[in-house]
């Protein structure tokens, strides 16, 4: 997160990161009791590694009563989402077991009613990513509140050049950004998860390349299908 | 299929206005701005102005802002343009492009004859 | 106002042939953003433009890579490897790195 500030601890109990190796990959979001939503390109740099999910977490380093990692039973990406391109960037991540719920861990409600939200809305966006252009990482959760950002500016030639489709959403990344490592994290506005964070390798904090997000609520179908 | 389907050529008075019009099909109209060029015969393109849908907020080639209005309609998906205090000079093919990749779609074209 | 200089005026081939247009901007135009937004268009006699290359050297889905892009800073190319009676008509350079946008002033590619 560039230009954010330590979040208070705990206080996003759906908030994960999911871990390659016992390091911090991308970020997540527990959505039910056994499935955290994150981003398929998270996948592409796990490699061979063992994937887990850190839940329960302000620092990733400290001893805390409410951490505990997980296994991944099962990973789902999205069937259509590619290598090459941002779009359907979504994973949904099976825990071996249900987590264990309590004041910070809980899921998150996300958003089904396939609908844009409207530009200027301030939304919040938490990850464990880079905190400085020179890749300084956080130890402790970061989060910035970002104003979302009208489809037809994000799609502008001078910012993502009609590369936005109906199922992203965009952010204001005027020097308060997004950036590597929070992929995957939750963008929450109202209360309710809108949109994750995809893991482009887009610069970070220039207010001309605005922050990509896919819509959860376009994924309504999938989720649920997925999840059942 | 997107499309952009511009109004009919217009045959004008000098001194009067204009009002040229830009119907946009096979995609979302407030995802994109919409541009607006002209051309006169013989001559190269020259931008005009754009417009965000969304907000019917536009900006102007400063070379056109006494000369052009641009307005958006969502309800009919149609970007328009008004030209006043028309001159002979205003005679031109008048073109809507989407931005979005770059300039990749544009409309036929609208011909403004201006004469007395 | 950014100009765009385009030479030649008129650019008379034989189809096969390889045929380059040069643009040259009257500054750089690389944007804020680090991108430069310069971009090619061709348009056909009683047509719109049609969109061949953007951001200096990215070819347009469904255009032929006998064209290419190529350049930076101030000066731009245009070539057509192998020129086809279907590519003939005037060749606009434009840049959209600067507000306002501006096109160069065409080169008309003929049969010789």
């Known amino acids: 997160i560039l230009g954010g500030r330590e979040a208070e601890a705990h206080a996003r109990p759906y908030m994960a990161s999911v871990q390659v190796n016992g390091e911090h990959l991308c970020g997540g979001v527990l959505v039910a009791e056994q499935w955290v939503l994150s981003a398929a390109h998270c996948l592409e740099d796990a490699a061979d590694g063992k994937v887990q999910v850190l839940l329960g977490a302000h620092s990733l380093s400290q001893p805390e009563p409410s951490k505990r990692l997980y296994d991944v039973l099962r990973a789902v990406p999205h069937p259509d989402s590619r290598p090459d391109t941002i779009d359907h960037d979504l994973l949904l991540l099976q825990l071996s077991e249900k987590a264990t719920l309590g004041p910070a861990v809980r899921p998150l409600p996300w958003q089904r009613v396939d609908r844009d939200v409207e530009p200027g809305t301030l939304c919040d966006v938490a990850g464990w990513g880079i905190v400085s252009h020179a890749g300084r990482r956080p130890d402790r959760l970061q989060h910035v509140l970002l104003p979302v950002l009208d489809r037809a500016t994000c799609n502008r030639r001078t910012h993502h050049d009609g590369a936005i489709t109906q199922r992203m959403m965009c952010a204001e990344s005027n020097r308060r950004d997004s950036c590597k490592g929070d992929s995957g994290g939750p963008l929450v506005c109202g209360g309710v998860l809108e949109g994750v964070v995809t893991s482009g390798s887009r610069v970070c904090g220039n207010r001309k390349k605005p922050g990509i997000y896919t819509r959860v609520a376009s994924y309504a179908a999938w989720i649920d299908s997925v999840l059942a | 299929e997107v499309q952009l389907q511009q109004s009919r050529p217009e045959l004008v008075k000098p001194g009067a206005s204009v009002k040229i019009f830009c119907k946009a099909s096979?995609?979302?109209?407030?995802?994109?701005?919409m541009n607006w060029m002209r051309q006169r015969h013989g001559e190269t393109l020259e931008w005009i102005g754009d417009i965000n849908p969304n907000n019917g907020d536009p900006s102007y080639n400063q070379k056109f802002k006494d000369k052009a209005t641009l307005t958006v309609d969502k309800s009919s998906s149609t970007a328009s343009m008004e030209l006043r205090s028309l001159t002979s000079d205003d005679s031109a093919v008048y073109y809507c492009?989407?931005?979005?990749?770059?300039?990749?779609?544009w409309g036929q074209g609208t011909l403004v004859t201006v004469s007395a | 106002d950014v100009l765009m200089t385009q030479t030649p005026l008129s650019l008379p081939v034989s189809l096969g042939e390889q045929a380059s247009i040069s643009c040259r901007s009257s500054q750089t135009i690389v944007h804020s953003n680090g991108d430069t937004y310069l971009e090619w268009y061709l348009q056909k006699p009683g047509q719109s433009p049609n969109l061949l290359i953007y951001?200096?050297?990215n070819r347009f889905s469904g255009v032929p890579d006998r064209f290419s892009g190529s350049g930076s800073g101030t000066d731009f190319t245009l070539k057509i490897s192998r020129v086809e009676a279907e590519d003939l008509g005037v060749y606009y350079c434009?840049?959209?790195?600067?507000?306002?946008?501006?096109f160069g002033g065409g080169t008309k590619l003929e049969i010789k």
């Open positions: 492009a989407r931005e979005g990749p770059s300039f990749a779609y």
């Open positions: 096979g995609y979302t109209f407030t995802d994109y701005y």
């Open positions: 434009f840049q959209g790195s600067h507000v306002p946008p501006t």
């Open positions: 951001k200096v050297s």
